[in-house]
Interface confidence: low
């Protein structure tokens, strides 16, 4: 992940018998929130395992870097960092493990140069779809991020709404076309059991996407036509059973594509041929050696680089459960 | 309340097209997957697909793919089910419904599609 | 697909008896994804159960589900009138989305 971090070297604390801070007043220049650490050489303001209800109101107007993991915020009004001055130099935002289940429309609003936010491991039942554009307009003002990491953001299954967990993160992502910019998104472990097509086709800035250890079975709706610039794409431990001959092409087309493929239940029948084919030509695919099938079980653990059309057949059909989709 | 109010009765002959409308109220459209599901004369009920209103995408179930195309207008809260080359097999009510993980919470009345020469 | 298959396909009993419903998944299920819906003639259908075992809001406790893997279970501990119904499995965990052919819970 590409979390901020910090090369401070010197942290001013703040006095630790004080309460949460709530100031009206706009901040002195060297202030440090309660229960933060801040350098102003470094621009960075940390507030972990603090066990924080809200993001403190007197952040420093100076913060490039702001640290607030590891609390108990619950959940991220509209305007939460929202300041009198704004917080004009922030620019990498960590949120993860901060119990966030609610992020409302607008939370990132008033941060102008806000390029890096990180909002993993939080169990976001509710995320807004107006998140991060901040408006409802059918086209809002381009957010300034370019990293947007959302790694283990999934709630346990008795927190979710009622409602599609892909389309929620899918709506907060495409909401206002806010996100054009957008160059790194993680989604990793978050149990999506489809990769909702809009999502790529909407990102034509993407560099790099991680959807490892998901739930994906089939990647036919998908077109990575227009990912023109994708660098990485991480698909490692999911539930694919083959790529076919659309998705192998697009995935060649791309000029400085990586792609990593481990840890999938790859099914060697007649369906997986030309896939088979393409892995022994190309060379987008970082460690194809070790790619094996799962299934049938008499192909269980066969190198798929080793196999020839021989070897993949449809005789017998397999249990439905196992069909390429 | 939710109420998801879908289009009156239709009959078609053999070839044609159908398209229902669901129009949803009592809640925000594009936070919750809409699905479409049929359901013959004296038989079960038949998934055909979902639309996912805030980012537009679709999933067809393969057996209507080709035939059936699902959209929605947002500014109106209405999602669409077309079905085109009609069988007299495809005589059925076509219900949507609201939800998608945790099950369909929430049932249009239903469409009664007639497909008879 | 993943066939879900309902049994009984009839269900005769009286009022005040105990329901018991089946359905076997073809391969395994989450039980996150598997739900349970009534529906009577000519209605719409009605979540009785979400995530095997969860009463959807409004539905009286005598419904109750349990089950895991391949094999799912509705109960009706007590019958009332107005439960005579057909009653249908669905899985939400792998597409094509799939329902079980129903049970008819019908007065004897």
């Known amino acids: 992940s590409s979390s901020p971090t910090s090369s401070a070297s010197s942290f001013s604390s703040s006095a630790p018998f004080l309460a949460s801070a709530v100031s009206a007043q706009p901040p002195l220049p060297d202030q440090c929130p309660a229960l933060c650490e801040c350098s102003e050489a470094a621009r960075t303001v940390k507030c972990v395992n603090r066990n924080l209800t809200e993001v403190p109101t007197d952040l420093p107007a100076y913060v490039r870097n702001l640290f607030l993991t590891g609390n108990q915020l619950a959940v991220l009004p509209a305007g939460a960092f929202a300041r009198r001055p704004p917080l004009a130099e922030l620019a990498a935002l960590n949120l993860s493990g901060s119990r966030l289940d609610e992020v409302r429309a607008g939370a990132f609003e008033h941060l102008p140069s806000l390029r890096q936010l990180d909002l993993s491991h939080n169990p976001l039942a509710d995320l807004s779809p107006f998140a991060f554009s901040g408006s409802n307009a059918s086209v809002s003002a381009p957010s300034p991020l370019v990293e947007l990491i959302l790694n283990h953001i999934v709630p346990p299954e008795d927190e979710r709404q009622n409602r599609s967990f892909e389309g929620m993160v899918v709506a907060a992502l495409l909401a206002g076309r806010a996100l054009q910019g957008l160059r790194r998104l993680e989604l990793a472990s978050n149990h999506f059991l489809y990769l909702p097509r809009d999502v790529l086709a909407q990102l034509p800035s993407l560099r790099h996407l991680d959807l490892s250890n998901n739930s994906l079975v089939s990647l036919t709706y998908v077109s990575f036509r227009n990912l023109t610039h994708l660098e990485s794409l991480h698909l490692e431990d999911n539930a694919l059973k083959v790529l076919h001959n659309g998705t192998l092409a697009e995935l060649q087309g791309l000029p400085h594509i990586r792609v990593f493929l481990d840890n999938n239940p790859w099914v060697c029948d007649c369906h997986m041929a030309d896939m088979v084919t393409w892995l022994k030509e190309t060379e987008v695919v970082q460690g194809k050696d070790r790619l094996t099938c799962a299934y049938p079980e008499k192909m269980r653990n066969r190198v798929l680089l080793e196999l020839n059309s021989a070897d993949l057949d449809c005789d017998p059909i397999l249990p439905p459960s196992l069909q390429t989709s | 309340q939710v109420q998801l109010v879908q289009s009156g009765a239709e009959v078609k002959k053999p070839g044609a097209s159908v398209k229902v409308s669901c129009k949803a109220s009592g809640y925000t459209f594009t936070d919750y997957v809409i699905s479409w599901v049929r359901q013959a004369p004296g038989q079960g009920l038949e998934w055909m697909g979902e639309?996912?209103?805030?980012?537009?995408?679709?999933y067809y179930n393969e057996k209507f793919k080709g035939r059936v195309t699902m959209t929605r207008d947002t500014s109106i809260s209405t999602a669409y089910m077309e079905l085109s080359r009609l069988r007299s097999d495809d005589t059925a009510v076509y219900y949507c419904a609201r939800g998608g993980n945790y099950g369909f919470d929430y049932w249009g009345q239903g469409t009664l599609v007639t497909v008879s020469s | 697909e993943i066939v879900l298959t309902q049994s009984p396909a009839t269900l005769s009993l009286s009022p005040g008896e105990r329901a018991t419903l089946s359905c076997t998944a073809s391969?395994?299920?989450?039980?996150?994804?598997l739900h349970w819906y009534q529906q009577k003639p000519g209605l719409a259908p009605r979540l009785l159960i979400y995530s095997t075992s969860n009463l959807a809001s409004g539905i009286p406790d005598r419904f109750s589900g349990s089950g895991s893997g391949t094999d799912f279970t509705l109960t009706i501990s007590r019958l009332e009138p107005e439960d005579f119904a057909v009653y249908y499995c669905?899985?939400?965990?792998?597409?094509?989305?799939?329902f079980g052919g129903g049970t008819k819970v019908e007065i004897k």
């Open positions: 669905h899985q939400y965990h792998r597409s094509p989305l799939t």
């Open positions: 391969s395994s299920v989450n039980s996150n994804y």
């Open positions: 639309i996912y209103p805030g980012s537009n995408s679709i």
